[in-house]
Amino acid sequence: LSTCKTIDMELVKRKRIEAIRGQILSKLRLASPPSQGEVPPGPLPEAVLALYNSTRDRVAGESAEPEPEPEADYYAKEVTRVLMVETHNEIYDKFKQSTHSIYMFFNTSELREAVPEPVLLSRAELRLLRLKLKVEQHVELYQKYSNNSWRYLSNRLLAPSDSPEWLSFDVTGVVRQWLSRGGEIEGFRLSAHCSCDSRDNTLQVDINGFTTGRRGDLATIHGMNRPFLLLMATPLERAQHLQSSRHRR
Amino acid sequence: LSTCKTIDMELVKRKRIEAIRGQILSKLRLASPPSQGEVPPGPLPEAVLALYNSTRDRVAGESAEPEPEPEADYYAKEVTRVLMVETHNEIYDKFKQSTHSIYMFFNTSELREAVPEPVLLSRAELRLLRLKLKVEQHVELYQKYSNNSWRYLSNRLLAPSDSPEWLSFDVTGVVRQWLSRGGEIEGFRLSAHCSCDSRDNTLQVDINGFTTGRRGDLATIHGMNRPFLLLMATPLERAQHLQSSRHRR
Amino acid sequence: ALDTNYCFSSTEKNCCVRQLYIDFRKDLGWKWIHEPKGYHANFCLGPCPYIWSLDTQYSKVLALYNQHNPGASAAPCCVPQALEPLPIVYYVGRKPKVEQLSNMIVRSCKCS
Amino acid sequence: ALDTNYCFSSTEKNCCVRQLYIDFRKDLGWKWIHEPKGYHANFCLGPCPYIWSLDTQYSKVLALYNQHNPGASAAPCCVPQALEPLPIVYYVGRKPKVEQLSNMIVRSCKCS
């Protein structure tokens, strides 16, 4: 059952390395590596590192194995993030604080800046940092739909935990909708799952960015980790296939 | 960029056909095809055809693409089905009929007959025939947990439809649990999704097997299409690797 | 499964995932990818040793089928099964970019 | 995608899914599978024409990468991408059995 050819492992490795050279450039639609002549000196900006780490980290609720990729998904996706509008914004005043829900609003102008056209968006994740949780909690995510109506999106069963943990919800379809519409501010609601019989519907889970009365410096750190949308999209110029051998902004 | 070898398409087809011969036998762990000497004359029994058709049909809520298969899933899975205990059974009396839920109970002895050991089960689907539906309905599936408590399993948003349609819920983990436990009767509950604010929690969807006052002959057809568990499992003798070149029943 | 757990700790001659770490600077002569400095790309290698002919004794080879030719191919090939993405940070001019490259890391292989 | 829609209606020379109907009785000489009588098994065939060397002009071949070597393999191979199961009915003695065979029908191929 043997092939009788001796395999030159080093040659195979060299071929694989060369193929990877081409793979990376082709996924970025670059005919050659970008010059580094104008890269600012010093370490990477904090915000860029945070974004890179967000992308690198597998989080609860995200599938570990990618699906077989459609052709469009072969190419690299630019990753950006849009932080939730801070809770002192007046938009939050319209929604009565309840024991069973928290609200998260996003500025669509920021979303459009990151993703100019809905068709370019390949994935959008709502990421929430849940703090420690004493009891199991079943939560549901809703999308703000019209004046005061909410549309169910998905749910998650949260296990008790002693340490903070990032949660991720796939909200690609919703964000694509928002990009197509004219609204200025759009939002989500995270609620306790309410069964038809049960009356104990309190949202037990504590999401970073919603607790109050913090010391100033802590509040800033806290604010950095407030809910955000992680967006993966095809850059406009890459989508237009105008790149050929060009490195455009 | 060409390979410069002419491909003998007929040879490739012959090789593929021969490989399929081996593939089918190996998936069934047969060293040779089973003898047909004792096969009853005439067409296949109705129940067998119904089961074959259930397996062949893709249904709403079932993923179209298989995951990359784990090694154990290489081998063929025997398909059986266990119908829901009929609604006139006394078990249903314990659960008050409500506008927001319907109940489905299953005999675990029937399940054990089909799948003697939990580890043999590779997939279990709860299949329900939904009749026409005038409005969109968000439903949730629960598993009977302890005396009068229910554990949430999954949900589905049902679009309005003029024609009946099979729904499928993956309940593999639940059925595996049931096979491990000593209970005699186990069950599911299908409920309207209840939001914390909304009070209109009526289950609008009509599931075949629960409507009453039918003409006798129709009731039988109706009963045939009542909710059932479609089970895919490794036959015990195949799992024990005792088959080798034997055909055991 | 022919994954990193099994293949990296065995001397499997047949189809398996093989270790390969790519250091962008050393292996590709690139300094333009700022993060990561390199990654475990890995690759699939090894024969899918299967012989089919009309006079094959099925009883002998059927047991090997699952591993060596599960897809009943006319000429099975050792290829990636599970793949993972790789996020990178690089600059275009003065602007930093974070991009995710799909299917860059081979986690397991299969004969297909 | 190199699927049945594209491949069956084109004269693609490179990697593509090819039509193959298996009639259990005619092709395999079997009468023991009662349902179905046969099935569209299909298969993958065709070169994944890619040449890599250190002096390759990347600008010329990068556009072909997506199709011919998306996984950056050292030797890409035309293999199944999407597969579907096949349920069958057969008898063991007097007892009919319905069994599902995984990954039997090739719906699309890829260079991997």
Epitope: S32, P33, S35, R248 | - | W30 | -
Partner: antibody, heavy 118, light 107 residues
Framework: EVQLVQSGAEVKKPGASVKVSCKAS????????MHWVRQAPGQGLEWMGR????????RYAQKFQGRATLTVDTSTSTAYMELSRLRSDDTAVYYC???????????WGQGTLVTVSS | DIQMTQSPSSLSASVGDRVTITCRAS??????LNWYQQKPGKAVKLLIY???NLETGVPSRFSGSGSGTDYTLTISSLQPEDFATYFC?????????FGQGTKLEIK
């Protein structure tokens, strides 16, 4: 077709200033940096500086810091290079060139000869 | 600044000849080496970028190679329209610097 069209030749006295224009067409002006390069008679090419039409950000070669001024008018897709306190050794052909982030100049203007003579 | 040394500074050759021009950088420039052609009264033209990539529309008789600090431009079979001045340029580190040029003349 991508084109850069420069203004005509100039003759200037030492100490004076000169302003050369470069009109871009055939591409999105704000998507690429514009660079300026000069070539003295019989000499090689010398990089002077660049401007980012999108942000207005500028970078000069040390030699030209304080004497060269780069500007853009995005409404007309035109870049300008002004050189002040001219000396006779500033006599050269001045080129505008579109910069590709791959590290090269992919499109050049036809050049503008500036002669500094008393 | 990175110094770029081009050689030869001038070169006489005939139509059909194979010609090689070299460029040496004062430090490793990681393949960010480009070649340009200049003809009197015409705009400068990009020939090759990133060591070996042929710009669209440039004839395939032009090729580039090299790595580290040493790079080469080769014209496999000289054509009459190839007589011009050729410059190399490094795109690795600011300020961008050029070679002094090689004037290719008809023998």
């Amino acid at each position: 077709e991508v084109q850069l069209v420069q203004s005509g030749a100039e003759v200037k006295k030492p100490g004076a200033s000169v302003k050369v224009s470069c009109k871009a067409s055939g591409y999105t002006f704000t998507s690429y940096d514009m660079h300026w390069v000069r070539q003295a008679p019989g000499q090689g090419l010398e990089w002077m500086g660049r401007i980012d039409p999108q942000s207005g950000g500028i970078r000069y070669a040390q030699k030209f810091q304080g004497r060269a001024t780069l500007t853009v008018d995005t409404s007309t897709s035109t870049a300008y290079m002004e050189l002040s306190r001219l000396r006779s050794d500033d006599t050269a052909v001045y080129y505008c060139a579109r910069w590709d982030y791959g590290g090269y100049f992919d499109v050049w203007g036809q050049g503008t000869l500036v002669t500094v003579s008393s | 600044d990175i110094q770029m040394t081009q050689s030869p500074s001038s070169l006489s050759a005939s139509v059909g000849d194979r010609v090689t021009i070299t460029c040496r950088a004062s430090q490793d420039i990681y393949s960010y080496l480009n070649w340009y052609q200049q003809k009197p009264g015409k705009a400068v033209k990009l020939l090759i970028y990133y060591t070996s990539n042929l710009e669209t529309g440039v004839p395939s008789r032009f090729s580039g190679s090299g790595s580290g600090t040493d790079y080469t431009l080769t014209i496999s079979s000289l054509q009459p329209e190839d007589f011009a001045t050729y410059f190399c340029q490094q795109g690795d580190t600011l300020p961008w610097t050029f070679g002094q040029g090689t004037k290719l003349e008809i023998k």
